[in-house]
């Protein structure tokens, strides 16, 4: 049994880091493998992560971590029984994938203005709370070409757009994702999408 593609990990910089790897053949990850992880300089027993299958030869493990800080550095040991298959390290702050925003709501009753709001996925005491910026994706269910991205570079989790910038009388969907420039993170996953019917009063044309 050998590791074909060594583990790569990303952290949500809060409580979970996710590591993925591939073996050289079909593997029952949860019964055959264990990923041990430990903060450097600690002398207590390493934490054990039981991996799950992620495709035939792929494995994924969700590592539980508490109060992550930028200096944290973990040793990683991948074991098959008594055989050490791979040894490495992982610094969560250098491989951050933020949590997805939640509770996306479209408020349509604000005088021909659409107000989109969502929740910051981090608690106020987390470093990323004040460092997230967002991208909002709005698209038409009827017209695949009607697809747009709005970059929200301020901290407030909201976006205002004129309803008239979208077509009237049709349904739209929106979703939002986050990233943090300070840690050069990857984008989060998209939030669940929310749907609304866009309608507004056309202004009278002057002749």
């Amino acid at each position: 049994m050998k590791v074909l593609q060594e583990p790569t990990c990303v952290s949500d910089y809060m409580s979970i880091s996710t590591c993925e790897w591939k073996m050289n053949g079909p593997t029952n990850c949860s019964t055959e493998l264990r990923l041990l992880y430990q903060l450097v300089f600690l002398l207590s027993e390493a934490h054990t992560c039981i991996p799950e299958n992620n495709g035939g030869a792929g494995c994924v493990c969700h590592l539980l971590m508490d109060d992550v800080v930028s200096a944290d550095n973990y040793t990683l040991d991948l074991w098959a029984g008594q055989q050490l298959l791979w040894k490495g390290s992982f610094k969560p702050s250098e491989h951050v994938k933020p949590r997805a925003p939640g509770n996306l709501t479209v408020h349509t009753n604000v005088s021909d203005t659409l107000l989109l709001t969502w929740s910051n996925p981090y608690p106020p005491d987390n470093y990323l709370y004040n460092h997230l910026t967002y991208a909002v994706n709005i698209w038409s269910e009827n017209d695949p070409a009607d697809f747009r991205i709005y970059n929200v570079t301020y901290l407030e989790p909201s976006l205002r757009i004129a309803a008239s910038t979208l077509k009237s009388g049709i349904s739209y969907r929106a979703r939002v994702r986050a990233w943090a420039q300070c840690y050069n993170t990857t984008w989060s996953e998209w939030s669940p999408s929310t749907k609304w019917h866009n309608s507004y009063r056309e202004p009278f044309e002057q002749h």
Epitope: L42, D66, V69, A71, D72
Partner: antibody, heavy 118, light 107 residues
């Protein structure tokens, strides 16, 4: 509840030996590194020794190297500190403490007093 | 061994004051620093680990900051229960030295 109870302290003459014990309960003793920390009367805290969860790694502060030995019996949930060639400057309240899973010492005993005097 | 120097040694303050205690390391210890509170006749209590991570159950008026060689423990609004001794401790490379302590007393 999580608890550490030290014992074995007392009055001893310089050059003699003493063995301290620390009984642990309320947590999985065999999973955690354990420490000895001392505090001389009216003074600050001084780290003495640490032992890894399985006893395979041991580290000591310079002033006790070669004289003190830390050990553990995971089957009995007990930590030990064997103190040989004791000196007057070893007089202190000795605490055992548990390593936190995110650094620092999060559980402490009430301490046992060692007095080295002729 | 890495030396830890705390200042001030004694700090006189009143209830409601904002106070700060500084800890300096003789060489860089990254974020590997803990803060403890000790009351007379009692064992120390862990307040903060990894320089800034507040332990569960510790009041939010306590905060830690710093990295490298300079660290600060701040109490935003002193309460009567906060008058005690405070110690920093570094845990870099299997060495665990404490600072000499700061006694926080009522003015």
């Amino acid at each position: 509840q999580v608890q550490l109870v030290e014992s074995g302290g007392g009055v001893v003459q310089p050059g003699r030996s003493l063995r301290l014990s620390c009984a642990a309960s309320g947590f999985t003793f065999s999973s955690y590194a354990m420490y000895w920390v001392r505090q001389a009367p009216g003074k600050g805290l001084e780290w003495v020794a640490v032992i890894s969860y399985d006893g395979s790694n041991k580290y000591y502060t310079d002033s006790v190297k070669g004289r003190f030995t830390v050990s553990r019996d995971n089957s009995k949930n007990t930590l030990f500190l064997q103190m040989n060639s004791l000196r007057a400057e070893d007089t202190a309240l000795y605490y055992c403490a548990k390593e936190s899973s995110s650094y620092g010492l999060d559980v402490w005993g009430q301490g046992t007093t060692v007095t080295v005097s002729s | 061994d890495i030396q830890m120097t705390q200042s001030p040694s004694t700090l006189s303050a009143s209830v409601g004051d904002r106070v700060a205690i500084t800890c300096r390391a003789s060489q860089s210890i990254s974020n590997w620093l803990a803060w403890y509170q000790q009351k007379p006749g009692k064992a120390p209590k862990l307040l903060i680990s990894k320089a800034s991570s507040l332990k569960s159950g510790v009041p939010s008026r306590f905060s830690g900051s710093g990295s490298g060689t300079e660290f600060t423990l701040t109490i935003s609004s002193l309460q009567p229960d906060d008058f005690a001794a405070y110690y920093c401790q570094q845990y870099n490379s299997y060495s665990y030295t404490f600072g000499q302590g700061t006694k926080l007393e009522i003015k």
